[in-house]
């Protein structure tokens, strides 16, 4: 999917006001310096498909990251704010719907929500050069 | 099956407010994008905007920004549609409008329609 | 906002007629057309979405085709029913818009 056409000022808004406090809520108890940004992103549209890969793509280690409320209000916010999105990712998520998983909390899935947090903060300053 | 119900016709006056409903039924209404669209009389259709009833999260078309206020209540599976300043260019049929697949902003299920008047 | 221009605004056929009704867009909008009925009093019908994809329960004499700009919705043999309003819309970008409609009027 092509982020480009994304109201980036309404999702930005969306993940000030909430979606930030539920990434931060997951990762209680976690120090901020554990885990090393290895994931970087250079404009928006390239954030939020970054994003959108280490939120909704099961990888080794975890798979169940969908189901969080980051997760869910991620996908609503996409599906709002960037028209066409929710019709990409119809067989996706039916299939995530189908798999209700019980959620683990592995520090590989802390790990990869960490990434999340440096993507949504380079989301959020789409003016500063690449480090 | 799902179904959307709607509210009655309303006449408004110039400079006033209307508050149109749409109850869904037949599904969960959580996680399913309900837009509103309207067609004046003899007109083509016009998207007005579009609520993520789950987290309230809210789009509208940049004609309608500041007159329009779309709102949900989950408890009740309602969708309101809110348009104030009203003038007569304003008469329509409202409709509001939902897909059958998450998230998706296809509009597969429509209410009846609401007919709004707006005349002195 | 993309413009969504239909032709023709109206025609006239006969039952068992091919009909072609065109839609184009003021840039491009990748597959992202959907197309709805509207019979008089009623609200819109989704037919077709993905520019070609028909919908659940909806009749295969319709079809769509057409990305990036040109997009064409056929009905292989028309029926008594299918007298009605057709509307191409776009999905691609924010506000979602609609062409003018095209009516199909009985011959």
């Known amino acids: 999917y092509d982020f480009t056409n994304c109201d980036f000022e309404k999702i930005k808004a969306a993940y000030l006001s909430t979606i930030s406090k539920d990434l931060i809520t997951y990762m209680s108890g976690t120090k901020s310096t554990e885990f090393n940004n290895t994931v970087s992103c250079s404009n928006r549209p390239h954030c939020l498909t970054e994003i959108q890969s280490l939120t909704f793509n099961p990888t080794a280690g975890c798979a169940s990251l969908a189901k969080e409320m980051f997760a869910m209000k991620t996908k609503a916010a996409l599906a709002i704010w960037c028209p066409g999105y929710s019709e990409t990712q119809i067989n996706a998520t039916q299939a995530m719907k189908k798999r209700r998983k019980r959620k683990v909390t592995t520090n590989k899935c802390l790990e990869q929500v960490s990434q999340l947090q440096g993507l949504w903060r380079r989301f959020n300053r789409p003016l500063l050069k690449q480090q | 099956q799902v179904q959307l119900v709607q509210s009655g016709a309303e006449v408004k006056k110039p400079g006033s407010s209307v508050k149109v409903s749409c109850k869904a039924s037949?599904?969960?209404?959580?996680?399913?994008?309900i837009s509103w669209v309207r067609q004046a009389p003899g007109q083509g259709l016009e998207w007005m905007g579009h609520i993520s009833p789950e987290f309230g999260f809210t789009n509208y078309a940049q004609k309608f920004q500041g007159r329009v206020t779309i709102t949900a209540d989950e408890s009740t599976s309602t969708a309101y549609m809110e348009l104030s300043s009203l003038r007569s260019e304003d008469t329509a049929v409202y409709y509001c409008a939902r897909s059958g697949m998450f998230y998706s902003i296809l509009f597969d299920y429509w209410g009846q329609g609401t007919l709004v008047t707006v005349s002195s | 906002d993309i413009q969504m221009t239909q032709s023709p605004s109206s025609l006239s056929a006969s039952v068992g007629d091919r009909v072609t009704i065109t839609c184009r867009a003021s840039q491009d909008i990748y597959n992202y057309l959907n197309w709805y009925q509207q019979k008089p009093g009623k609200a819109p019908k989704l037919l077709i979405y993905g520019a070609s994809s028909l919908q659940s329960g909806v009749p295969s004499r319709f079809s769509g085709s057409g990305s990036g700009t040109d997009f064409t919705l056929t009905i292989s043999s028309l029926q008594p029913e299918d007298f009605a309003v057709y509307y191409c819309q776009q999905q691609n970008d924010y506000p979602l818009t609609f062409g003018q409609g095209t009516k199909v009027e009985i011959k």
């Open positions: 037949g599904g969960t209404f959580s996680s399913y994008a």
